[in-house]
């Protein structure tokens, strides 16, 4: 867990868990079905997914100056994706296989977000899009797109934690 009241997370733990997330996100992705995306437009559920951008302080200099900006952004994204993975997009039909990595992925997102949440401090979480129940036929594409954007997100987060573990750990 983050150091109580402090500004530094347990970088090494976060690095390990973010690497696990990367592995899970890649292993889950092909299991949601091979999709032909040529005729598919963007879906509103995946339009507003969090991205880590230049102004988020996740570059080496930003992390040195004040890592909290970047960590808050990562935390928001983790919560966002954790909610999406618990929505009926993933829990409804068509059913995921019992041994699907999506369950582990969901738990690991929650685990990393808890590591980042300092004791007694609650960051504002980004608004989750209000998800009206999706139709089963839409879910295959939505899962594909959500996992694809999650892969990109956790890849950046893993690089941040790797840098933090190497240069910012006490």
């Amino acid at each position: 867990r983050a150091v109580p009241g402090g500004s530094s997370p347990a970088w090494t733990q976060c690095q390990q868990l973010s690497q696990k997330l990367c592995t899970l996100a890649w292993s889950a992705h092909p299991l949601v079905g091979h999709m032909d995306l040529r005729e598919e437009g963007d879906e509103e559920t995946t339009n507003d997914v969090p991205h880590i951008q230049c102004g988020d302080g996740c570059d080496p200099q930003g992390l040195r100056d004040n890592s909290q900006f970047c960590l808050q952004r990562i935390h928001q994204g983790l919560i966002f994706y954790e909610k999406l993975l618990g929505s009926d997009i993933f829990t409804g039909e068509p059913s995921l296989l019992p041994d699907s990595p999506v369950g582990q992925l969901h738990a690991s997102l929650l685990g990393l977000s808890q590591l980042l949440q300092p004791e007694g401090h609650h960051w504002e979480t980004q608004q989750i899009p209000s998800l009206s129940p999706s139709q089963p036929w839409q879910r295959l594409l939505l899962r594909f797109k959500i996992l694809r954007s999650l892969q990109a997100f956790v890849a950046v987060a893993a690089r941040v934690f790797a840098h933090g573990a190497a240069t910012l750990s006490p």
Epitope: G33, H34, M35, D36, L37, E39, E40, K83, G86, S87, D88, T91, G92, E93, P94, S95, P98, G103, L131, P133, Q135, P136, W137, L140, L141
Partner: antibody, heavy 115, light 113 residues
């Protein structure tokens, strides 16, 4: 193994409410939606709606909106279906069922509405 | 809502003979991006909940005997019992899970001739 165990038969008067429970075991309760389906005597199957135990999100068949409420208690892995303003044509066996394409159903609960 | 229509309503077949049940949907159940049909077949015996036989129109549920097979695509589907056994006497339902509300066919009663 996955099991869905429902509460016992009920006899209700017209205008009353009934609440049927469905206790799940053998899987992670919050990982799958729970559907409710009913079957009137000698009739076919009718989908009533579902609840997502993870976030309590519901999706009801328009036919039952305003009369049905689906809830869950994640601490006991139990789903509930309450039907209000009962009429005689609500007499049916009510089933809970986990995602259709994996085929797990409760044993059914007979609800008889009679004056 | 998608309307599911089964035929025939009832069917009497000799033991060991083939039984064929048809199911027609009012709109296509085929999702073109992965070429899957969102259709399931159930078997229901008196006093029991329905039992899943087939999903994705043609994928047999584990433990279901291989005499049961599903075929078809789009709006027209078929459940075939290649060699009817005494324990197959039941009502059979098709069901679409392409969109809400999920809907079922009216059922086909299979008996022994």
């Amino acid at each position: 193994q996955v099991q869905l165990v429902q509460s016992g038969a009920e006899v209700k008067k017209p205008g009353a409410s009934v609440k049927v429970s469905c206790k799940a075991s053998g899987y992670t309760f919050t990982s799958y939606v729970m559907h409710w389906v009913r079957q009137a005597p000698g009739q076919g199957l009718e989908w009533m709606g579902y609840i997502n135990p993870y976030n309590a999100g519901t999706n009801y068949n328009e036919k039952f909106k305003g009369r049905v409420t689906m809830t869950t208690d994640t601490s006991t892995s139990t789903a509930y279906m309450e039907l209000r303003s009962l009429r005689s044509d609500d007499t049916a066996v009510y089933y809970c069922a986990r995602n259709w394409d994996v085929g797990y159903w409760g044993q059914g609960t007979l609800v008889t509405v009679s004056s | 809502d998608i309307v599911m229509t089964q035929s025939p309503d009832s069917l009497a077949v000799s033991l060991g003979e083939r039984a064929t049940i048809n199911c027609k949907s009012s709109q296509s159940l085929l999702y073109s991006s992965n070429q899957k049909n969102f259709l399931a077949w159930y078997q229901q015996k008196p006093g029991q909940p329905p039992k899943l036989l087939i999903y994705w129109a043609s994928t047999r549920e584990s433990g279901v005997p291989d005499r049961f097979s599903g075929s078809g695509s789009g709006t027209d589907f078929t459940l075939t019992i290649s060699s009817l056994q005494a324990e197959d006497v039941a009502v059979y339902y098709c069901q679409q899970y392409y969109s809400y509300p999920f809907t079922f066919g009216q059922g086909t009663k299979v008996e022994i001739k």
